[in-house]
């Protein structure tokens, strides 16, 4: 015997109390793909989430976070703090750098500055709490007298620190 | 159904006090950190304050410490705010929302809120 809930589209379930046949998802409900048994319930976004895409008899609802929150998770699971630059999100809420890291961003942890002098740089640009240092020539470029022909410096092994 | 219903809002004079109310439904209240947020009319989302799943912690947004306590009580599954000395910024739209699986470990990001309750402070 032919099974005829695999006829029924998208949007549609097979209504097993209705001789199998294709009936339209409830209200709030939907169905992705054919030959569905049931309909799904639509994704509500209430409270910190909001509505990014209104469910249809063929999709749920997508959800995006309200203003001050970014979506984290698949599908936008949760919703999480923004801090401002310079600040990390800590559970006693947004914390500024402490001193020799930044961040530069909304979201993240706190990185540490770039060590110039293990690359054999010097620091062009001081960091801060929200930007990087800037590293620039190594310290014997700058020195007066020093010759333009310098070698750089040997190339370090990945994964290798400076003895 | 997990569902979070916050009640206790209201019209209130700046330097009074209200206890906003979220009763939790479909999960295990004492599983999870809980948290106030708010909104502001035309701003963003603010975190307010969390407490842990025992109540031994308890975190607030620097505008509110003094002034506002987080509390649950887990046999009744509910999550309360008593907010005192209130002001006319802390007139806002208050949510309670869940923090997800991991919450403090990995992420802070918060998986379930209710609708709100409307808290105005004006004389």
């Known amino acids: 015997l032919q099974d005829l809930c695999s006829n029924c589209p998208a949007g549609t379930f097979c209504d097993n109390n209705r001789s199998q046949i294709c009936s339209p998802c409830p209200p709030n409900s939907f169905s992705s793909a054919g030959g569905q048994r049931t309909c799904d319930i639509c994704r509500q976004c209430k409270g910190v989430f909001k509505t990014r895409k209104e469910c249809s008899s063929t999709s749920n609802a997508e959800c995006d976070c309200i203003s001050g929150y970014h979506c984290l998770g698949a599908e936008c699971s949760m919703c999480e703090q923004d801090c401002k630059q310079g600040q990390e999100l800590t559970k006693k809420g947004c914390k500024d750098c402490c001193f020799g890291t930044f961040n530069d961003q909304k979201r993240g942890i706190c990185r540490p500055w770039t060590n110039c002098s293990l690359d054999g740089k010097s620091v062009l640009v001081n960091g801060t709490k929200e930007r990087d240092v800037v590293c620039g020539p190594s310290p014997a470029d700058l020195s007066p007298g020093a010759s333009s022909a310098t070698p750089p410096a040997p190339a370090r092994e990945p994964g290798h620190s400076p003895q | 159904e997990v569902q979070l219903v916050e009640s206790g809002g209201g019209l209130v004079q700046p330097g009074g006090s209200l206890r906003l109310s979220c009763a939790a439904s479909?999960?295990?209240?004492?599983n999870y950190w809980m948290n106030w947020v708010r909104q502001a009319p035309g701003k963003g989302l603010e975190w307010v304050a969390n407490i842990n799943q025992d109540g031994s912690e308890r975190y607030y947004v620097d505008s509110v410490k003094g002034r506002f306590t987080i509390s649950r009580d887990n046999a009744k599954n509910s999550l309360y705010l008593q907010m005192n000395s209130l002001r006319a910024e802390d007139t806002a739209v208050y949510y309670c929302?869940?923090?997800?699986?991991?919450?403090?470990?990995?992420?802070?990001?918060?998986?379930?809120s209710g609708q709100g309750t409307t808290v105005t402070v004006s004389s």
């Open positions: 929302a869940r923090g997800g699986e991991g919450y403090g470990v990995d992420h802070y990001g918060l998986d379930v």
């Open positions: 479909g999960f295990t209240l004492s």
